[in-house]
């Protein structure tokens, strides 16, 4: 969480951002809130990016003002216009690119004052893993697949029964470049698994951590997976 304060002749207002991550090819949110003002026509929101000459986005007098927008963001940005009056200056970024990573500034002017806060935005790819029993294999084998990751993640297997065990000797992980030549498909195979046990396939890079669990018994198979973004710090 980053909290910034204005330092002008006017009063300062508090602006708060949250560091976040964008998934390449999908839409992302750059989060920013400020002390609300009841005078909508007086509110100005400016999003700037370090190293970029033009503006990322500008909202003023109740609508987008994009004449100064940098080419790299053309047609890809929007604020939640209906939420500005209650202090939400968050920016929706369409079709996130690897090059969108960097330091952004959310700069706010209201009738009460000015304020700004910076935001670190990371970009990469992350996806939910799915763990299945590989019936084609000669021995009891589990296959963990996740379609899109970048940068290249680490993959670690764990087991409920053999807690703390190192499965690196009985697993094999491969990374296959996807067609857009940036993200990769992750495939990890775990051999010699035993029934009546829960196995976890954990995939992690500096942006996200995802886990796929599978419980194999004689009568059924139960699966569960979840994904968590790392380093969501407010500012």
């Amino acid at each position: 969480l980053i909290i910034g304060f204005g330092i002008s002749g006017r009063h300062s207002i508090t602006v708060t951002t949250v560091a976040s991550a964008g998934n390449i090819g999908e839409d992302g949110i750059l989060s920013c809130t400020f002390e609300p003002d009841i005078k909508l026509s007086d509110i100005v929101i400016q999003w700037l990016k370090e190293g970029v000459l033009g503006l990322v986005h500008e909202f003023k007098e109740g609508k987008d003002e994009l004449s100064e927008q940098d080419e790299m963001f053309r047609g890809r940005t929007a604020v939640f216009a209906d939420q500005v009056i209650v202090g939400n200056a968050s920016l929706r970024l369409k079709n996130v690119q690897l090059t969108d990573a960097g330091t952004y500034k959310c700069y706010i002017i209201t009738s009460k004052g000015k304020g700004n806060a910076n935001l670190e935005y990371k970009t990469g790819a992350f996806s939910m893993p799915e763990v299945n029993v590989d019936y084609n294999a000669s021995s009891e084998t589990l296959r963990c697949e996740a379609p899109r990751w970048f940068p290249q993640p680490t993959v670690v297997w764990a087991s409920q029964v053999d807690q703390g065990a190192n499965f690196s000797e009985v697993s094999n992980t491969s990374f296959e470049l996807n067609s857009e030549n940036v993200t990769m498909k992750v495939v990890s195979v775990l051999y010699n698994v035993t029934i009546n046990n829960t196995y976890s396939c954990m995939i992690e890079n500096d942006i996200a951590k995802a886990t796929g669990d599978i419980k194999v018994t004689e009568s059924e198979i139960k699966r569960r997976s979840h994904l968590q973004l790392l380093n969501s710090k407010a500012s």
């Epitope: 609300p36 009841i38 005078k39 007086d42 007098e61 216009a81 939420q83 009056i85 209650v86």
Partner: antibody, heavy 117, light 107 residues
Framework: EVQLVQSGAEVKKPGASVKVSCKVS????????MHWVRQAPGQGLEWIGA????????EYAPKFQGRVTLTADTSTSTAYMELSSLRSEDTAVYYC??????????WGQGTTVTVSS | DIQMTQSPSSLSASVGDRVTITCQAT??????LNWYQQKPGKAPKFLIY???QLAEGVPSRFSGSGSGTDYTLTISSLQPEDFATYYC?????????FGGGTKVEIK
């Protein structure tokens, strides 16, 4: 659940003052503007003013400037509207209304103020 | 101040009718307009925000549209519980101002 609960009806004489309260629950009271709106019998809605409890910033409609005072007690999440120098045309239902998710999204039940000699 | 002219001031309609209420601002309010429903002896109820977005729990027979200075509230098929007074509110420019109201009565 968001709730705005107002104080009871008041009967006042011309020239007197009235203070209406509005107790808030269900959202962060200090971080959002609280407005006051009134409605005279058989008439439309009229904005009086607003307060930002976190900083005690206030804004008033020019018509009420100098005669209305908005305050807030952040310890009890209660907003107050005091109207002085009452006259018969101030007879109305007074509402508090929040701007939490949107402008005037939640309303108090209203407080009837009757000014009569 | 921005003036909001609401029309008609009252209308009579039957259950199942399509009803349209309009609000005209004295200047562009950039879609910064909400609609409220009020029944006798009750506080106004939040209906539509930012011209066209339905508030939580509001039936889909209600819809809003408009831009610039002209805005419309439409009830596609009037139900018995819809007989009430409707108000528009502009919050683009200070101070916020309401329309005069439209009373929807049973024919």
């Amino acid at each position: 659940e968001v709730q705005l609960v107002q104080s009871g009806a008041e009967v006042k004489k011309p020239g007197a003052s009235v203070k209406v309260s509005c107790k808030v629950s269900g959202y962060p009271f200090t971080s959002y503007w609280m407005h006051w709106v009134r409605q005279a019998p058989g008439q439309g809605l009229e904005w009086i003013g607003a307060i930002y409890p976190g900083k005690s910033d206030t804004e008033y409609a020019p018509k009420f400037q100098g005669r209305v005072t908005l305050t807030a007690d952040t310890s009890t999440s209660t907003a107050y509207m005091e109207l002085s120098s009452l006259r018969s045309e101030d007879t109305a239902v007074y509402y508090c209304t929040s701007t939490w998710t949107h402008y005037f999204d939640y309303w108090g039940q209203g407080t009837t103020v009757t000014v009569s000699s | 101040d921005i003036q909001m002219t609401q029309s008609p001031s009252s209308l009579s309609a039957s259950v199942g009718d399509r009803v349209t209420i309009t609000c005209q601002a004295t200047q562009d309010i950039v879609k910064s307009l909400n609609w409220y429903q009020q029944k006798p002896g009750k506080a106004p109820k939040f209906l539509i925000y930012y011209t066209a977005q339905l508030a939580e729990g509001v039936p889909s027979r209600f819809s809003g549209s408009g831009s610039g200075t002209d805005y419309t509230l439409t009830i596609s098929s009037l139900q018995p519980e819809d007989f009430a007074t409707y108000y528009c509110l502009q919050f683009y420019e200070f101070p916020p101002t309401f329309g005069g109201g439209t009373k929807v009565e049973i024919k």
